[in-house]
């Protein structure tokens, strides 16, 4: 037989076995010009020493073969002995290692069999009523097709599905959408209405995420507040990655799960912007404020469930950093300025009350004064920190107040509001004899002692009413008792106590008169 012709003899090898896992697959035959035809196929398994034979049976009942050698593509003309106007059956037999493997057959009319392409280019994926909708441009000059899809998950084999007939410039397919696992889809096409025409190759994989993005399972830790008033939020546990089908591993556009970090700064509510969304990979620095943090997972079908944490405020205080002066016009705070053109947010709330009751004030951008200090003033009429109670004050700073992640904590401290010097005056001063020349003075703790770091010291004053001599005794803020010694019997004394803050001298308590009685010996 001539190589260009189909040989009408028995093939030169024994009968075939189509049951093995390897062998020829996916035979496609079609007309490529007015008088030429091509068949191509795939071979699965080791290719060394394999000879392929394209078999053909005609409507007349006669059968022939083309010897293709090691090639998996063969062209022939309409003069090769194969009738192209009538139905024929074609298949491939591959002879290797003393056995023959056989492909599935195709039965078709070669003249009317056109080479169809799979969907090419961009396949758009969307969700429609709980199903997956795929849409693509029909390949040029190929309107009118039957379309099939196959799909698999990471744990299941390929399943075949039908898209139905297509007859437009764009083609589409409705496919099943999995709730919780990613899928790989491939599509193929063949000529519509041409009995037995060959299927195209399978398209490139279309990777589809589950309808529900996986819930993020992550953990955070927050570092200590640094010298710059910022602390780093770090991810302790990465979100679990979605398991992907074989063809989607590596680069799988479409299945990506995006994890976003949503920050909500709870402190300083008077600032312009309270929330910011970031990519999870870019972990931010935070001020010492309280935050709510949410991790939101989303894929091409939208957001999924989120996971939320509360990051409490950093309560480390620096009692010396803030200077407060109270004048007739009002109160002014001074603190070391951060930099040029900084906006400050001053937040205060009564101690022991819910964080929701915080009040704040935003300064206009300000430069440091000649002493390198930043200031904030308010009048008595404003009512700010006007009540005689303990307030917790935090000052935040930012050169870009509209950017949530650029705030830093300048300081946190306590302040006693209202007329602190009067309100802090110790009450219930009492004097008890201690010895022949000494007394013990006790008093109730000043209201200032409820405010950590505010009470600097107590001062106890003793006045000799005879000589008008005065002595003053400083007492630690944690103590509410002192022993006065070196006193003389029979002399009248008055004692007073005051409570001082770092910036304010207290008001003396009411004078308390006492004397040590003269001891008369029997």
């Amino acid at each position: 037989c001539r190589t260009s012709e189909c040989c009408f003899q028995d093939p030169p090898y024994p009968d075939a076995d189509s049951g093995s896992a390897s062998g020829p697959r996916d035979l496609r035959c079609y007309r490529i010009s007015s008088d030429r035809y091509e068949c191509s196929w795939q071979y699965e398994g080791p290719t060394a020493g394999v000879s392929h034979f394209l078999r053909c049976c005609l409507s007349s009942g006669r059968c022939c073969y083309f010897a293709a050698g090691s090639a998996t593509r063969l062209q022939f003309s309409d003069q090769a002995g194969v009738s192209v106007l009538y139905t024929v059956t074609l298949w491939v037999e591959s002879w290797a290692r003393n056995q023959t493997e056989k492909s599935p057959e195709v039965t078709l009319q070669l003249y009317n069999s056109v080479k169809y392409e799979p969907p090419l280019g961009d396949i758009k994926v969307s969700k429609l009523a709980g199903q997956l909708r795929m849409e693509w441009e029909t390949p040029d000059n190929q309107v009118g097709a039957e379309v099939q899809f196959r799909h698999r998950t990471p744990s299941s084999p390929w399943k075949l599905g039908d898209c139905g007939p297509q007859d437009d410039d764009t083609e589409s397919c409705l496919c099943p959408l999995e709730m919780n696992v990613a899928q790989e889809f491939q599509l193929r096409r063949r000529q519509l209405g041409s009995q037995g025409s060959s299927w195209s190759k399978w398209s490139s994989p279309v990777c589809v995420p589950p309808e529900n993005p996986p819930q993020p399972q992550v953990r955070f830790s927050v570092e200590q507040l640094g010298q710059d008033g910022r602390r780093r939020l770090t991810l302790k546990e990465q979100p679990t990655q979605l398991e992907l089908p074989e063809g989607c591993q590596g680069l799988a556009p479409g299945t990506e799960v995006t994890y976003r970090l949503q920050l909500h700064m709870l402190s300083c509510p008077c600032k312009a912007k309270a929330t910011r969304t970031l990519h999870l990979g870019k972990m931010p620095y935070l001020s010492g404020a309280a935050y709510n943090v949410a991790v939101i997972s989303s894929n091409q079908f939208g957001p999924g469930l989120n996971q939320t944490w509360h990051i409490p405020a950093d309560t480390h205080t620096e009692p010396v950093a803030l200077n407060i002066s109270v004048g007739t016009n009002g109160t002014t705070m001074y603190w070391p300025a951060r930099a040029q053109s900084m906006t400050y947010c001053i937040e205060w709330q009564p101690v022991g009350q819910d964080g929701g009751l915080a009040t704040c004030s935003l300064t206009a951008p300000q430069d440091p004064d000649p002493a390198g200090m930043a200031t904030y003033s308010w009048s008595r009429e404003s009512g700010a920190m006007g009540q005689e109670k303990c307030y917790y004050i935090t000052i935040f700073a930012s050169a870009h107040p509209e950017k949530l992640t650029l705030w830093s904590t300048v300081l946190s401290t306590y302040h006693f509001g209202g007329n602190a010097s009067a309100a802090g005056t110790p009450h219930h001063v009492s004097v008890k004899n201690h010895s022949l020349d000494s007394v013990s003075v006790d008093w109730a703790p000043s209201l200032l002692s409820t405010c950590p770091g505010v009470l600097k010291e107590y001062v106890v004053r003793c006045r000799d009413e005879d000589s008008k001599q005065v002595s003053e005794h400083p007492v630690q803020p944690t103590e509410t008792q002192v022993t006065l010694s070196g006193l003389r019997a029979g002399v009248a004394y008055t004692v007073q106590v005051r409570a001082d803050t770092a910036w304010l001298r207290g008001v003396w308590s009411q004078p308390q008169r006492f004397s040590i009685e003269v001891q008369v010996s029997d």
């Epitope: 075939a16 076995d17 409507s59 009942g61 059956t89 599935p104």
Partner: nanobody, 123 residues
Framework: QVQLVESGGGLVQAGGSLRLSCAAS????????VAWFRQTPGKEREFVAS????????NYADSVKGRFTISRDNAKNTVFLQMNSLKPADTAVYYC????????????????WGQGTQVTVEP
Amino acid sequence: QVQLVESGGGLVQAGGSLRLSCAASARIFNSYAVAWFRQTPGKEREFVASISWSGGSTNYADSVKGRFTISRDNAKNTVFLQMNSLKPADTAVYYCAADRNYYPSVLGKYTYWGQGTQVTVEP
């Protein structure tokens, strides 16, 4: 060598159904096309239906189209012919035949043949 054994024939009323089976001895049977033929006394053997080794291609004589269905189970080395809406004219001995080629029409020479099974349809 492939040996074929038919079964499932019998007597049935017109309009009834029968299912014929063709079992093969050889493991290589899953790479063979199989056809059913029938013959009545004094007449030539007549093609009924054929199926390819993959099961992807089937072919029927015009007289049985829509009534008969050919199928195969390669795991069991068996081919079936489901015959519904039987008519007295379907009475014949039914033969199963196998070949390494699949013929796209009623014509074709088959290498291996069974002994046949009798189907009788009463009016």
